[in-house]
């Protein structure tokens, strides 16, 4: 069975979050997709969405968020550039399928942004999460205001027993620190 999990990314201010959400391409290839933030006890808030119908590998930029939908692969790429401490939070990808409720994709992303020391000795200058180039074409897409009350979530369990960390032999120094946490609904 598919488990709903969280993946935790710990990044510094100014870096870039670069993630992907996969979906069933036969069902959702051209459906409109969105990137949402979930604040405890609140309804998810849509921050950016693809066009409707979603265009293949056509970047859509809304502020510091770039979405790119690879239809033929069933992958939505999400980049949040120039991260700020206040970007910290829980995020998810959803697929709009009106009149039905949005379809939530796996996994959720727990983003933790901390103050950085860019440019000072010892700073992680070559972190891949700093990499960002402006896509050749960007478009602003209008997102439906519809959010489903059913996707309101509780905070994940605080128990550390269910936290699995990446394999010990992987050096995550220049990747990103990721922790998978099962989410129980």
């Amino acid at each position: 069975a598919t488990k709903l999990t969280e993946e935790k990314y710990e990044l510094k201010e100014g870096q870039t979050l670069d993630v992907k959400c996969d979906y069933t391409l036969e069902k959702f290839a051209s459906s409109q997709k969105a990137w949402q933030i979930i604040r405890d006890g609140e309804m998810p808030k849509t921050l950016a969405c693809t066009e409707r119908p979603s265009k293949n590998s056509h970047p859509v930029q809304v502020g510091r968020i770039i979405l790119e939908d690879y239809h033929d692969h069933g992958l939505l790429r999400v980049r949040m550039v120039n991260l700020q401490v206040e970007d910290s939070g829980l995020y998810q990808c959803v697929i709009y399928q009106p009149p039905k409720e949005p379809h939530m994709l796996f996994d959720r992303i727990r983003l933790v942004v901390t103050k950085g020391f860019s440019g000072t000795p010892g700073s992680n200058e070559n972190s891949t999460q700093n990499v960002y180039k402006i896509p050749p074409t960007t478009t602003k897409a209008l997102c439906p205001l519809y959010t489903s009350p059913r996707t309101v979530t509780q905070a994940p369990p605080k128990s550390t027993a269910d936290v699995s960390t990446p394999d010990s032999e992987i050096n995550l120094t220049n990747v990103t620190d990721i922790i998978r946490v099962p989410v129980f609904n």
Epitope: T2, S57, K133, R180
Partner: antibody, heavy 123, light 107 residues
């Protein structure tokens, strides 16, 4: 330690199908995407596609889209790649590969490789 | 699709030599580039990820640099076990593609 163990060599006739298995151990199978890469004898590496073992979703390059099926059995931590309508050009070593980062990361760095499965297509 | 062009396609060198291989992308791929080593009859091995980061356990004589379209892979002092074929691979977008490979032979 992370290990990907693939099924043995296969000889197939043109038009037939082949199903290669890839058994994972040493990590949580559903946490990392599995990719498939092939290499014809004396040739370079060719990416075929990916599969997320947690969701079961997969994607493949246009060249293979109508012929390849990627599946998994999470109960035995095994991924499968089936290629149909085989032709002589499909003769190659097929590798299953695990990425460096978790499924959600846009990090297509092929860190752990299976030993490869030689598929020979000949009449 | 992004084309990755490696040069040279083959190279002869001696133990102790400094060796450089280049990889050129058909368009800007930022730092989304990896390097692999493959020995005959074996699976490839990840050496460098994100253009310049050394994979855990890989000797420090291997290094990578570059960004945008031009990348360089260097072995500072060639060892007998380094004779192999080397591949670059981009992941700036889908589909992922590899260079055609550089075969490093003993002179």
């Amino acid at each position: 330690q992370v290990q990907l163990v693939q099924s043995g060599a296969e000889v197939k006739k043109p038009g037939a199908s082949v199903k290669v298995s890839c058994k994972a151990s040493g990590y949580t199978f559903t946490s990392y995407d599995i990719n498939w890469v092939r290499q014809a004898t004396g040739q370079g590496l060719e990416w075929m596609g990916w599969m997320n073992p947690n969701s079961g979703n997969s994607g493949s390059v246009k060249k293979f889209r109508d012929r390849v099926t990627m599946t998994r059995d999470t109960s035995i931590s095994t991924a499968y790649m089936e290629l149909s309508s085989l032709r002589s050009e499909d003769t190659a070593v097929y590798y299953c590969v695990r990425l460096i980062g978790y499924s959600s990361a846009w990090k297509w760095s092929f860190q752990h490789w299976g030993q490869g499965t030689l598929v020979t297509v000949s009449s | 699709d992004i084309q990755m062009t490696q040069s040279p396609s083959s190279l002869s060198a001696s133990v102790g030599d400094r060796v450089t291989i280049t990889c050129q992308a058909s368009r800007d791929i930022s730092k989304y580039l990896n390097w692999y080593q493959q020995k005959p009859g074996k699976a490839p091995k990840l050496l460098i990820y994100d253009a310049s980061n050394l994979e855990t356990g890989v000797p420090s004589r291997f290094s990578g640099s570059g960004s945008g379209t031009d990348f360089t892979f260097t072995i500072s002092s060639l060892q007998p076990e380094d004779f192999a074929t080397y591949y670059c691979q981009h992941y700036d977008n889908i589909p992922i593609t590899f260079g055609q490979g550089t075969r490093l032979e003993i002179k």
